[in-house]
């Protein structure tokens, strides 16, 4: 589809005569009829197969034809066609005299013809005008012509339809040959495929508009080259989507088991030393002068019970002072004025006189010590438990509670790996550098999840007078370790003073 355009430029008829030689009265009021048809070697009358057009009266005798494309499109003359331009044509241009206002062929006498020209040849589609001049005996016509494609038609013969668009079906303009030219940011045969952000990962990323980078599930970041850890992951990372690779100090499927409580929480106060002892478990070793689970309590000078033989301690600004019971003296009431006659030995101790009755010595039964057998034996003072094991007093004996990865009476043996499925009751086994660790299901505890969770007998704080409470794991009962000066299963009785 296109348009044959004919631009009339100048017509010369100096004598103002018709083709017959007869002059026009008063002058030749001239208009043109144009016929465009298929190529003929000899142009003959017949249908104007490519179209025809007539002009109004353009002038009298000789005149120049001005451009009038804005005023109704009369010059250049437009001969549209809706077929593929064949590249050849025949053109007939007739100049006629109009005696009156009616320019219809049937209203004109046949001798009103002024001149007739006919040309034929090849013509390629293009913007350039071809200039031509045809001269007869009495007239001369100067004109130019061209063939251009209609809007949205392109190519050598105006046969390629191309309509620019910028919507879901394409984003392009049209090149002169009718090929699509994608708008910036689009590609593909019909320019429907956006060009993603530069560097957007080919597999992990995609885009729905130019310069975008949207990530497929499991990927994140500007270029979709960072993975997303598993939904349940707590303290882990990934190298592929949905992984959970634990950070240092964390364990478990979702990296939610704290294997390094000391580092993560710094629970020990006042410069104490922290030791990890399993999942969310730790032990604080206090500096002198501090006590408590987290070494949060500051000891007074009297907290070490320095006064012997039932002496009472009084804190002073510059230290402490012991008030000795009758029969004792010295800085710590360590010297006795008593003899065996005064029954100074407690807890069933037997008295032996020394220095001809001037002093005495107590022989204590098992589990008791001190110059008057007033102290319960602490069998853990020698730190017998190896590998960070916790020592527990158990009446006349002691036992070691081992850290994960160790076993034996004194935690002296290193447990091997998890190959033997050592965790009971569905416990999960973890191989650690320090040995293995069992993560127990609810209701079970112990190094191998072998113990049904027992009650904490010390939870009710049954021991009096700042005594230390221990749970006897074999009987689920408590044992109180009394401070100096107190006795009884709950340390509820003060030590009786010997008779003076």
């Amino acid at each position: 589809s296109g348009v044959f355009q004919l631009q009339l430029q100048e017509f010369v008829n100096e004598r103002g005569v018709l083709a017959s030689g007869r002059p026009c009265e008063p002058g030749c009021r001239t208009f043109f009829r144009v016929c465009l048809k298929h190529f003929q070697a000899v142009v003959s009358p017949g249908p104007c197969t490519f179209g025809s057009v007539s002009t109004p009266v353009l002038g009298t005798n000789s005149f120049a034809v001005r451009d009038d494309s804005s005023g109704g499109g009369r010059n250049p003359l437009q001969l549209p066609f809706n077929f593929t331009w064949p590249g050849t044509f025949s053109l007939i241009i007739e100049a006629w005299h109009a005696p009156g206002d009616d320019l219809r062929p049937e209203a004109l006498p046949p001798d009103a013809l002024i001149s007739k020209i006919a040309i034929q040849g090849s013509l390629a589609v293009g913007q350039n005008w071809l200039l031509d001049e045809q001269t007869s005996t009495l007239t001369r016509l100067r004109y130019s012509y061209r063939v251009i494609c209609s809007d949205n038609y392109y190519g050598d013969n105006c046969s390629r339809l191309c309509k620019k668009r910028n919507d879901h079906f394409g984003h392009y303009v049209c090149q002169p040959d009718g090929n699509l030219s994608c708008l910036p940011g689009w590609t593909g045969e019909y320019c429907q495929q956006p060009i993603c952000l530069s560097g957007c990962h080919e597999q992990n990323g995609y885009c729905s508009k130019p310069a975008e980078c949207l990530c497929r599930p499991g990927w994140q970041g500007r270029l979709c080259n960072e993975c997303i850890p598993h939904n349940g992951c707590r303290h882990g990372t990934c190298s592929t989507p949905w992984q959970c690779t634990c950070d240092e100090g964390w364990g478990g499927l979702f990296c939610d088991q704290d294997l390094n409580y000391c580092t993560h929480h710094s629970p020990c106060k006042n410069g104490a030393t922290c030791s990890n002892s399993g999942q969310r478990s730790y032990t604080c070793t206090c500096r002198p002068g501090y006590t408590g689970v987290d070494c949060e309590l500051e000891l007074s000078e009297c907290d070490s019970n320095p006064c012997r033989n039932g002496g009472s301690c009084k804190d002073q600004e510059d230290g402490y002072h012991c008030l000795c019971p009758p029969g004792y003296y010295g800085l710590h009431c360590e010297h006795s004025t008593l003899s065996c006659a005064d029954s100074p030995c407690f807890n069933g101790g037997s008295c032996r006189e020394r220095n001809q009755g001037a002093s005495y010595a107590c022989e204590c039964p098992p589990n008791f010590t001190g110059s008057n057998c007033e102290k319960k034996v602490d069998r853990c003072t020698s730190n017998p438990c190896a590998n960070g094991g916790q020592c527990l007093n158990r009446g006349p004996s002691r036992m070691c509670r081992c850290r994960p990865g160790f076993t034996g009476t004194y935690c002296e043996r290193h447990v091997s790996d998890c190959a033997r499925n050592p965790c009971a009751h569905g416990g999960t086994c973890h191989d650690l550098e320090s040995g293995l660790m069992c993560t127990c299901p609810a209701g079970f505890s112990g190094r191998r999840c072998e113990v049904r969770t027992s009650i904490d007998a010390c939870a009710s704080s049954p021991c009096f007078n700042r005594a230390t409470c221990y749970t006897d794991l074999s009987t689920d009962t408590f044992v109180c370790n009394c401070p100096y000066g107190f006795v009884g299963s709950r340390c509820e009785f003060p030590v009786g003073l010997p008779p003076s």
Partner: antibody, heavy 118, light 107 residues
């Protein structure tokens, strides 16, 4: 235990601004992408914005683009939503969540109410 | 944007009942679908992800199935604490979108 605690909601006039904050704990914040999801009173859930773990790429729903800005401070384990040019239709409970636009929202905060009204 | 349509919008059931909620996507979302539970005045809680994977701590009476465009959440034996509103969500296509919700009420 994973905890996400939002703050900063309140009553604001149309055209006004508000900054929401979300304090995260119980997980290694810097490893995970984060999001804001909102719920208008009596309505359903609507994704608002996400940010990748490395803080290099935010995404927004079309209706808040150019008005809202999501950001994070990995050192403080905190997520933020700066809301400008607020409209009545932005009225909602805003939830801080751990997740991305292409993954489930695994953990949620308790929400903070934003009311835009004159 | 992908439209997510849940049915029914509301549902009455009794403790011990087996309950099914469906979710339909306007186009293929493969298995990239999650289910959430929300109780009044509370935040949503992830129940199921990737169509059929139970989130941590979610009881086994909850299960999910489906693929492509049609998905189902099933509660095998309803418990008193299960009465809530349930939402599906797709995360296959940008932007992520939620269903309108299904309110599960006690009969």
């Amino acid at each position: 235990e994973v905890q996400l605690v939002e703050s900063g909601g309140g009553l604001v006039q149309p055209g006004g601004s508000l900054r929401l904050s979300c304090a995260a704990s119980g997980f290694t914040f810097r490893h995970f992408p984060m999001a804001w999801v909102r719920q208008a009173p009596g309505k359903g859930l609507e994704w608002v914005a996400t940010i990748s773990s490395s803080d290099d790429w935010p995404n927004y729903r079309d209706s808040v683009k150019g008005r809202f800005t999501i950001s994070r401070d990995n050192a403080k384990s905190s997520l933020y939503l700066q809301m400008n040019s607020l409209r009545a239709e932005d009225t909602a409970v805003y939830y801080c969540s751990r997740g991305y636009y292409n993954s489930p929202f695994a953990y949620w905060g308790q929400g903070t109410l934003v009311t835009v009204s004159s | 944007d992908i439209q997510m349509t849940q049915s029914p919008s509301s549902l009455s059931a009794s403790v011990g009942d087996r309950v099914t909620i469906t979710c339909r996507a306007s186009e293929d979302i493969y298995s990239n679908l999650a289910w959430y539970q929300q109780k009044p005045g509370k935040a949503p809680k992830l129940l199921i992800y990737d169509t059929n994977n139970l989130a941590d701590g979610v009881p086994s009476r909850f299960s999910g199935s489906g693929s492509g465009t049609d998905f189902t959440l099933t509660i095998s034996s309803l418990q008193p604490e299960d009465f809530a509103t349930y939402y599906c969500q797709q995360y296959n296509n940008y932007p992520p979108t939620f269903g309108q919700g299904t309110k599960l009420e006690i009969k």
